[in-house]
């Protein structure tokens, strides 16, 4: 018996088609993805094949103005239109708190939303009961398939799930649910979740009874053969893990941003064992037409976005210096504003030991593309911020050794004076350079803001200590020559859309007046 699994993950509000790098579509003939194009391909496969499931492995939320404006209603509406069969909760589904998940998505979705390792307690338990499930048994043809969900246990550090949701270890939580499915005579079981490729592989290895793992969170691109676009495969599709009980378990993920549709064909025997698995992600390029009715619906929803982008978010009473002449040479107040917003966006998980889990921000000066003049009545709009941060990136959380940070700051000024983009703007960091010294030895002082303290203060960076840092995904991926970050990072979790972070901060503060205050000397 053959099952076709179609899957997406980390779509991050890319409801409209995008350019090849998943930013705003400029030349429509070269654009990719989007729900209208996805629907065309899904329908084509549904018509051609008998047993098809369409699954999403989480992080539909967060990433473009669509989410900023519609706050998840767009996710429910278009996933319903595409007739998804199931979705796992990702960490970003909690970005607007539990209410921001319950009302727009959990109550509106016509498909099951799953996570076995999230347990509600206190007053939330009754409120959220039945709105998400640990597993769901889906009829497919004359067979049944069990889908069991999971979510990154790091979610409390990455999003805003509040205090009434407990995120358990994925493997510990999944095993009893899979065992329960087995007692219900469900012998074909898919683990669908959002914890990253390493955890996906562990689930395949350790959870007895899981036949297939469909994952997300790490934006992993897997491919067998010659890849069709720019993404470099992290392994073959499917990636085969040998389980502890001797089975071959296929693990898949489909990159991110709706650029690909994962396509996996699984052959099950009478006992529910995987006899064979093969497939590849399908690149959703312009050779696949956009479905006209979904496209018309997108255009209808689009109107509200255009109105939103010119509305005032807040005011500045100072010039926001985002010029390259400043931000690529010295501390600039636009850099300070953005870094302060980045830290503010990550204020969570305080306890009696830590005032916050992260205190540091770095930001390449070259990523700041425009100033904002205060003489326009001080008004700041989304449109203004889109000029400052036009690349549609995210502000991510990484863990780095102090020695890696030191290398990054040396790289920041290794060719100082040429107006290059790698000059770092900072938050929660005091750095002193001596430009008379030779490149690679110019950082003479590097102090960082403590987190394990009740009164934050600056202490010298320790080379062997592990630090959390918020930075643009561009830097986490080694951009602007920061190869040491990419090569040496110990953990990387994707964060919120850059413009959204700054816009939320400005809306919260109402009036801003960032200064140049001696962070960089």
């Amino acid at each position: 018996w053959e099952l076709t699994i179609l899957h997406t993950n980390d779509v991050h509000s890319r409801l409209e088609q995008t350019s090849e790098d998943s930013s705003k579509c400029v030349n429509a003939s070269r654009c990719m993805g989007g729900v209208a194009r996805l629907f065309t391909k899904v329908q084509q496969i549904r018509r051609a094949e008998p047993n098809v499931l369409l699954l999403d492995a989480g992080d539909q939320y967060q990433g473009t103005i669509w989410f900023t404006v519609y706050k998840g209603a767009e996710v429910a509406h278009f996933m319903n239109a595409l007739r998804y069969d199931a979705m796992a909760l990702g960490n970003h589904e909690f970005d607007n708190g539990v209410e921001g998940l319950i009302e727009p998505l959990l109550k509106e979705a016509k498909f099951p939303i799953l996570s076995a390792n999230i347990k509600a307690k206190g007053p939330l338990a009754s409120q959220i009961s039945g709105l998400y499930l640990p597993y769901k048994v889906l009829p497919v043809g004359d067979e049944v398939v069990g889908i069991v969900g999971y979510t990154s246990k790091e979610t409390p550090f990455l999003s805003n799930p509040g205090t009434n949701l407990v995120f358990e270890d994925e493997i510990t939580a999944l095993q009893p649910e899979v065992d329960k499915l087995k007692t219900l005579n469900v012998n074909k079981i898919i683990a669908l979740g959002h914890s990253g490729f390493e955890t996906d592989k562990l689930i395949a290895q350790k959870v007895r009874g899981v036949d297939v793992v469909v994952g997300g969170h790490s934006n992993t691109f897997l491919y067998t053969g010659n890849p069709p676009s720019k993404e470099v495969p992290a392994g073959k599709y499917p990636f085969i893990v040998t389980s502890d009980d001797g089975r071959k378990v296929p693990v898949v993920q489909a990159y991110a941003f709706g650029k690909y549709l994962g396509y996996l064909k699984i052959e099950f025997d009478e006992r529910g064992n995987v006899i064979s698995s093969h497939g590849n992600p399908i690149l959703l390029n312009s050779s696949i037409p956009e479905d006209p009715s979904i496209k018309a619906d997108i255009n209808k929803w689009r109107i509200k976005l255009d109105n939103y982008s010119t509305q005032e978010l807040g005011k500045t009473i100072v010039y926001l210096d985002g010029s390259s002449q400043s931000c690529r040479f010295r501390e600039c107040n636009m850099g300070n504003l953005i870094c302060d917003a980045m830290i503010n966006n990550n204020l969570r998980h305080a306890d009696e030991m830590f005032w916050n889990h992260v205190s540091m921000c770095i930001l390449n000066g070259g990523g700041i593309r425009s100033p904002i003049d205060e003489r326009n009545n001080g008004t700041i709009t989304w449109e203004n911020l889109a000029a400052v941060l036009p690349f549609g990136g995210t502000f991510d959380l990484v863990q780095l050794k102090g020695s890696t940070l030191k290398k990054a700051f040396e790289h920041s000024v290794h060719r100082y004076g040429q107006s290059t983009g790698e000059f770092l703007q900072v938050g929660g960091i005091h750095v002193v350079y001596d430009l008379s010294r030779k490149p690679g030895d110019r950082v003479v002082k590097l102090d960082v803001l403590c987190t394990k303290c009740r009164v934050p203060s600056y202490d010298p960076l320790k080379m062997d200590e592990i630090y959390k840092v918020i930075l643009p995904n561009f830097l986490a991926n080694g951009g602007d020559g920061f190869q040491m970050i990419k090569d040496e990072l110990l953990r990387h979790d994707s964060g919120d859309q850059d413009i959204n972070v700054v816009s939320t901060y400005i809306s919260k503060m109402k009036v801003i007046y960032p200064a140049v205050e001696g962070r960089i000397k």
Epitope: W1, D142, K248, D269, E270, R271, V274, I275
Partner: antibody, heavy 113, light 106 residues
């Protein structure tokens, strides 16, 4: 639990027709096929034929003229019919799942007058 | 038809021995190979499917490997209950079996 239960006669006279039934539980005949295999005493396994989930059948060329495999999906039963039995057809007959994950208990069929 | 050549046809071994049985297909069968165990009573049980995946409840001393036309069943440390006849079965086309390997006590 996935099981196959065979039923049918243990003794058949030469020239007569053998009819064996395989009753399936734990999976559906609309999703999976059933294979038939035999094993003469002291010898190896020999494939006879298969009925697929869609209802079509394939047969070993050596038996195509006298072998029929049919099914009643609603009763979860598959029937093997072999005509013109001969003493050389004496063997243990097995039904098995399409992928060999499950086997019937086997029926020793002796062809003798 | 795809022919399966299994060797050896029989072997004598002691408890604790490592035993290897091979099957060669007449053409590429793309990992679509099972290993079956038949005890003297006649009951047939699948041990390994898709070349190398272990069936539920089968001890880890059994392992399968191979690709293309060459396939191997290995018993890492023979136990008393392992004395039986073993068959390879290809399902890339109409089923065909290897001739069997009888594993006897030395």
């Amino acid at each position: 639990e996935v099981t196959l239960k065979q039923s049918g006669p243990g003794l058949v006279k030469p020239t007569e027709t053998l009819t064996l039934t395989c009753t399936v539980s734990g999976f559906s005949l609309s999703s999976y096929g059933i294979q038939w295999v035999r094993q003469p005493p002291g010898k190896g396994l020999e494939w006879l034929g298969v009925i697929w989930s869609g209802g079509s059948a394939d047969y070993n060329a050596a038996f195509i003229s006298r072998l029929t495999i049919s099914k009643d999906t609603s009763k979860s039963q598959v029937v093997l019919t072999m005509t013109n039995m001969d003493p050389v057809d004496t063997a243990t007959y097995y039904c098995a799942g399409q992928y060999g994950s499950v086997w019937g208990q086997g029926t020793l069929v002796t062809v003798s007058s | 038809d795809i022919q399966m050549t299994q060797s050896p046809s029989s072997l004598s071994a002691s408890v604790g021995d490592r035993v290897t049985i091979t099957c060669r297909a007449s053409q590429d069968i793309g990992d679509r190979l099972n290993w079956l165990q038949q005890k003297p009573g006649g009951a047939i049980k699948r041990l390994i499917y898709a070349t190398s995946s272990l069936d539920s409840g089968v001890p880890k001393r059994f392992s399968g490997s191979g690709s293309g036309t060459e396939y191997t069943l290995t018993i890492s440390s023979l136990q008393p209950e392992d004395f039986a006849t073993y068959y390879c079965l290809q399902y890339a086309g109409s089923w065909t079996f290897g001739g069997g390997t009888k594993v006897e006590i030395k």
